[in-house]
């Protein structure tokens, strides 16, 4: 778990206890079973605007 008192990870990243830092969720493409990827799955990407009405 993230150490108390530390800032939460920015959007699109998740805390890794294995690495002791926030990790970019894009890194889950290289290694989907990394510990931080669970947090990435739980946090959906930023909402996007539909390209049609």
């Amino acid at each position: 778990e993230q150490a108390p008192g530390t800032a939460p990870c920015s959007r699109g990243s998740s805390w890794s206890a294995d690495l002791d830092k926030c990790m970019d969720c894009a890194s889950c493409r290289a290694r989907p079973h990394s510990d931080f990827c669970l947090g990435c799955a739980a946090a959906p990407p930023a909402p996007f605007r539909l390209l049609w009405p």
Partner: antibody
Framework: QVQLQQSGPELVKPGASVKMSCKAS????????IAWVKQRTGQGLEWIGE????????YYSEKFRGKATLTADKSSNTAYMQLSSLTSVDSAVYFC?????????????WGQGTTLTVSS | DIVMTQAAFSNPVTLGTSASISCRSS???????????LYWYLQKPGQSPQLLIY???NLASGVPDRFSSSGSGTDFTLRISRVEAEDVGVYYC?????????FGGGTKLELK
């Protein structure tokens, strides 16, 4: 360039322990996983476990839990594997390998292997 | 654990011709992201394994484009379009979907 330099061959007696090393260079040691893989003569590749050098957190194959102990020394950029209660079935070549965590997949890098012979 | 299965030997091939090596996984390696976590390694005699292919179809750095790979979620084929003498060795498939990291038993490429 990325290099993993493993320690030399070991000849040890049954029941003893051995500690082999894997010295990393050419990259930031704490940013990548070091995995250890066993290969008996003429046989395939068997994952033993892996370590995150920055935190020391480890993951082991159930088969090697209690047999192998993985550690890392950040000051010397060196990963270690200790094998205990050795028997003839532990005689093998042991490889260390750098595994990526990051989006830019740049492949795995392997050490040259350490040959362990367990014999009385 | 995911079991990776390979034939121990390939059909003997002639230099300059093509060769195919197969691999099967006990579980689909196709992730919800659309990536298939299948990897191919070559271990030449007396050497360490070297990565050839990652994520089923991507050529690793420095690997000649004579090598290619394709497959479904569980059945995979490595193809060498024009076999050279330096291609001789044992080819291993492996996955990177989860732990433990497991390898196939290896397929030895033999020349006629």
């Amino acid at each position: 360039q990325v290099q993993l330099q493993q320690s030399g061959p070991e000849l040890v007696k049954p029941g003893a322990s051995v500690k082999m090393s894997c010295k990393a260079s050419g990259y930031t040691f704490t940013d990548f996983i070091i995995a250890w893989v066993k290969q008996r003569t003429g046989q395939g590749l068997e994952w033993i476990g892996e370590i995150y050098p920055g935190t020391g957190r480890t993951y082991y194959s159930e088969k090697f839990r209690g047999k192998a102990t993985l550690t890392a020394d950040k000051s010397s950029n060196t990963a270690y594997m200790q094998l205990s209660s050795l028997t003839s079935v532990d005689s093998a070549v042991y490889f260390c390998a750098r595994r990526t965590i990051y989006y830019d997949y740049d492949g795995d890098y392997w050490g040259q292997g350490t040959t362990l012979t367990v014999s009385s | 654990d995911i079991v990776m299965t390979q034939a121990a030997f390939s059909n003997p091939v002639t230099l300059g011709t093509s060769a195919s090596i197969s691999c099967r996984s006990s579980k689909s390696l196709l992730h919800s992201s659309g990536i298939t976590y299948l990897y191919w390694y070559l271990q030449k005699p007396g050497q360490s394994p070297q990565l050839l292919i990652y994520q089923m179809s991507n050529l690793a750095s420095g690997v000649p484009d004579r090598f290619s790979s394709s497959g479904s979620g569980t059945d995979f084929t490595l193809r060498i379009s024009r076999v050279e003498a330096e291609d001789v060795g044992v080819y291993y498939c492996a996955h990177n979907l989860e732990l433990p990291w497991t390898f196939g038993g290896g397929t030895k490429l033999e020349l006629k």
